[in-house]
C-alpha cells in the first residue's frame, strides 16, 4: 500500500444510472450456494474521509475493545495502535484482554516514507457489522510509528487483506482473512463497494456518513448493476492483475502492454489515487491534456499540487475524458474493460480560501512500483476479491458518482491476443548467490 496518499468517501447519486444494464457475460458459471444474495448486516459498514482511508469497526480481545480499522487490500498484516499516540483517540490495551497471547516476537514495517513497529500476539477478533463469528487472529500491536497514523482520519489500525507472501515479518504469519476462512464456514471471498463523495466532507459529515460496504464471504446484488466480469489474480501476494490496453476517450495509448504492468498492477484499497508507471503516466496525462484543452490547467494541477476550481455547480465534466483499462479475461484471448469518469479521477477537496467554488485535485499520479488501482478506480465499481477462484470481479457500483450523460462501465468481451505477454516478470533474487 502506498501509505501517505490515502483515500475518499460517499456518492451523491446512487442507484443504477438511467436504468443502464450491461450485457450479461455469456459464459457465466452457476454460482455456488450461499455465495450470492443479501448481506444486509454488512451493507454500509464502511466509513471514510477523502484521502484518508475507508475503515470498518472491529472488536479485539475479551472483553471486546472496539477500534476502527482501515481496510487495505495492499498489505497483509492486521496491525493496531497499542500505545498512546497524539493522533489516536483510543488504542488496543493488551493488558485488559484475558484472551491475549504474546508471540514474543517483534515486527518492523518500513514504508518509503515512515514506518511502524510492534509486538506480535494473537487475540479474539470479530467484526460487529460482519459475519457473526469470532476468530483467533494474529495481531501486530503497534508500539512505535512514524508517518503512519493520520491526524483526524478516525482509524486506529489496519486490516491487511492481501496474501501471506507479503506479510511481515515473513509469510509464516497468517493474515486475518486466512484465519477467518480456516476457523469458520465463511467462504473464501470478500467484496468491496467504496463510495466516493463527489463533494468534500467535513469531520462531522464523515462521522455521520456512509462510506461503502465490505461484504465478507459473499456478493450482494444490491451493490452493483449489470454483470460482474472477472480477471485472474496473476499471483497471490498483492492482488495482482494484468492490464492489456489503456484508452483515453476511446483512443488507445498504443504502448507495449508490458509498460502498463511494469513492474506489477495491483488493486489496493489503501491507496487514494490511480497510480501509473512513469511512461504510462506521461502518456496518459498528455492524452488527457489534449482531450481537455479547451481550458488551460496549470502544470501543478497534473502533478497533484494545484487545485482547479469552478463556480459551485458548474464543473465542466464533459471536457474531461473517460479512462478505460482493459483487463485480462478468464477466457483465452478475451478481455473486458472498466471505464471511469472524471468524477472518479478528479478528487473533491475542501479549501476554506476557495469555499465558494467546487475545487478538485487530479488523482492520477506517477508510480515507481507499477500500476496501483486505488480508490479512484475502486469507487467506480463493486469489486469482488474471489480468493477461492483466484480472480477479481468488477461491476458498475450502485453508488458511483456520475452525471446524466456518462456513467462508469464494465463491458466485454473483447478479443485480445497474447495477453500473457503483458505481464512483467520481476527478477527473482537467487538466494544462493547471497551466501558468503
Amino acid at each position: 500500500t502506498q501509505h501517505g496518499i490515502r483515500l475518499p468517501l460517499r456518492s451523491g447519486l446512487g442507484g443504477a444510472p438511467l436504468g443502464l444494464r450491461l450485457p450479461r457475460e455469456t459464459d457465466e458459471e452457476p454460482e455456488e450456494p450461499g455465495r450470492r444474495g443479501s448481506f444486509v448486516e454488512m451493507v454500509d459498514n464502511l466509513r471514510g474521509k477523502s484521502g484518508q482511508g475507508y475503515y470498518v469497526e472491529m472488536t479485539v480481545g475479551s472483553p471486546p475493545q472496539t477500534l476502527n480499522i482501515l481496510v487495505d487490500t495492499g498489505s497483509s498484516n492486521f496491525a493496531v495502535g497499542a500505545a498512546p499516540h497524539p493522533f489516536l483517540h483510543r488504542y488496543y490495551q493488551r493488558q485488559l484482554s484475558s484472551t491475549y497471547r504474546d508471540l514474543r516476537k517483534g515486527v518492523y514495517v518500513p514504508y518509503t516514507q515512515g514506518k511502524w513497529e510492534g509486538e506480535l500476539g494473537t487475540d479474539l477478533v470479530s467484526i460487529p457489522h460482519g459475519p457473526n463469528v469470532t476468530v483467533r487472529a494474529n495481531i501486530a500491536a503497534i508500539t512505535e510509528s512514524d508517518k503512519f497514523f493520520i491526524n483526524g482520519s478516525n482509524w486506529e489500525g489496519i486490516l491487511g487483506l492481501a496474501y501471506a507472501e507479503i506479510a511481515r515479518p515473513d509469510d509464516s504469519l497468517e493474515p486475518f482473512f486466512d484465519s477467518l476462512v480456516k476457523q469458520t464456514h465463511v467462504p473464501n471471498l470478500f467484496s468491496l463497494q467504496l463510495c466516493g463523495a463527489g463533494f468534500p466532507l467535513n469531520q462531522s459529515e464523515v462521522l455521520a456518513s456512509v462510506g461503502g460496504s465490505m461484504i465478507i464471504g459473499g456478493i450482494d446484488h444490491s451493490l452493483y448493476t449489470g454483470s460482474l466480469w472477472y480477471t485472474p489474480i496473476r499471483r497471490e501476494w498483492y492482488y495482482e492483475v494484468i492490464i492489456v490496453r489503456v484508452e483515453i476517450n476511446g483512443q488507445d495509448l498504443k504502448m507495449d502492454c508490458k509498460e502498463y504492468n511494469y513492474d506489477k498492477s495491483i488493486v489496493d484499497s489503501g491507496t487514494t489515487n490511480l497510480r501509473l508507471p512513469k511512461k504510462v503516466f506521461e502518456a496518459a496525462v498528455k492524452s488527457i491534456k489534449a482531450a481537455s484543452s479547451t481550458e488551460k490547467f496549470p502544470d501543478g494541477f497534473w502533478l497533484g499540487e494545484q487545485l482547479v476550481c469552478w463556480q459551485a455547480g458548474t464543473t465542466p465534466w464533459n471536457i474531461f475524458p473517460v479512462i478505460s483499462l482493459y483487463l485480462m479475461g478468464e477466457v483465452t484471448n478475451q478481455s473486458f474493460r472498466i471505464t471511469i469518469l472524471p468524477q472518479q479521477y478528479l478528487r473533491p477537496v475542501e479549501d476554506v480560501a476557495t469555499s465558494q467554488d467546487d475545487c478538485y485535485k487530479f488523482a492520477i499520479s506517477q508510480s515507481s512500483t507499477g500500476t496501483v488501482m486505488g480508490a479512484v478506480i475502486m469507487e467506480g465499481f463493486y469489486v469482488v476479491f474471489d480468493r477461492a477462484r483466484k480472480r477479481i470481479g468488477f461491476a458498475v457500483s450502485a453508488c458511483h458518482v456520475h452525471d446524466e450523460f456518462r456513467t462508469a462501465a464494465v463491458e466485454g468481451p473483447f478479443v485480445t491476443l497474447d495477453m500473457e505477454d503483458c505481464g512483467y516478470n520481476i527478477p527473482q533474487t537467487d538466494e544462493s548467490t547471497l551466501m558468503t
Partner: antibody
Framework: EVQLQQSGPELVKPGASVKLSCKAS?????NFWIHWLKQRPGQGLEW???????????KYNQKFKAKATLTVDTSSSTTYMHLSSLTSEDSAVYYC?????????WGQRTLVTVSA | DIVMTQSQKFMSKSVGDTVSVTCKAS??????VAWYQQKSGQSPKSLIY???HRYSGVPDRFTGSGSGTDFTLTISNVQSEDLADYFC?????????FGGGTRLEIK
C-alpha cells in the same frame, strides 16, 4: 482556521547553515503541498521550491537547488527548509505558503541575517 | 522562466478613487494568475486567483481580469487601508514567478 507558524529570526555566520520550520494547523496536513519563498528588499518574491507532505516529494527552482533542502515531519505537521553555505545574498525574509489554488495561506515570515 | 512585468512601480490615489494595477506575462499563462497584497512588515495576503476569482473574505472592491498575457487588478473605492504593495504571480508553470510589485500610495 488555517495557520502556518514559522520559526523565529536567525543571525548566522557566512558559510554556516540554518534550518527554518513551518508548523501547519487548521487543515489536513497531507492534503496540500507546502512552498517556500524568498523576499529581499527591492528584489520581489522568489519561489524556492515545494514539498508534498503525503510522500515527501520535492520540486525546486533550479536557482535554489544547491542552496535549499526541504523536508517534512507529518507527525508534527511541520515542514523544514535547510539553507546551506550561507552568504550575504541569502540574507532575506523567508516565507512558507500552502498550496491550493496559487498560495492562499502564508506563514508570518522568518528573517535570516547572514553576518560575520 | 516566465517573466511577470508590473511596469508601474508606484501609483498614488485618493480615497474613493479607482485604481488599476497591470501585469504582463512573457508568455501565455491562461488564467493561472494570482494577486497578493503586502502591507509594510507583513506577509502577503491572497486576493485573487484564476485571474478573476476572489479568495474568501476579500472585499468585492477588489476585482481581477485578463487572460493569456495581460492581467489587471482593479481596486474601486480605494480606502486608506489599501496602502500596500501589490504583486501578481503566475502559477501556470514551474518555477512560479512574481511581478516586481506596484506600491499603492494614498494621497
Amino acid at each position: 482556521e488555517v495557520q502556518l507558524q514559522q520559526s523565529g529570526p536567525e543571525l548566522v555566520k557566512p558559510g554556516a547553515s540554518v534550518k527554518l520550520s513551518c508548523k501547519a494547523s487548521g487543515y489536513t496536513f497531507t492534503n496540500f503541498w507546502i512552498h517556500w519563498l524568498k523576499q529581499r528588499p527591492g528584489q520581489g518574491l522568489e519561489w524556492i521550491g515545494m514539498i508534498d507532505p503525503s510522500d515527501s516529494y520535492t520540486k525546486y527552482n533550479q536557482k535554489f537547488k544547491a542552496k535549499a533542502t526541504l523536508t517534512v515531519d507529518t507527525s508534527s505537521s511541520t515542514t523544514y527548509m535547510h539553507l546551506s553555505s550561507l552568504t550575504s545574498e541569502d540574507s532575506a525574509v523567508y516565507y512558507c505558503a500552502r498550496s491550493g489554488v496559487a498560495f492562499p495561506y502564508w506563514g508570518q515570515r522568518t528573517l535570516v541575517t547572514v553576518s560575520a | 522562466d516566465i517573466v511577470m512585468t508590473q511596469s508601474q512601480k508606484f501609483m498614488s490615489k485618493s480615497v474613493g478613487d479607482t485604481v488599476s494595477v497591470t501585469c504582463k506575462a512573457s508568455q501565455d499563462v491562461g488564467r493561472n494568475v494570482a494577486w497578493y497584497q503586502q502591507k509594510s512588515g507583513q506577509s502577503p495576503k491572497s486576493l485573487i486567483y484564476s485571474a478573476s476569482h476572489r479568495y474568501s473574505g476579500v472585499p468585492d472592491r477588489f476585482t481581477g481580469s485578463g487572460s493569456g498575457t495581460d492581467f489587471t487588478l482593479t481596486i474601486s473605492n480605494v480606502q486608506s487601508e489599501d496602502l500596500a504593495d501589490y504583486f501578481c504571480q503566475q502559477y501556470n508553470s514551474y518555477p512560479y514567478t512574481f511581478g516586481g510589485g506596484t506600491r499603492l500610495e494614498i494621497k
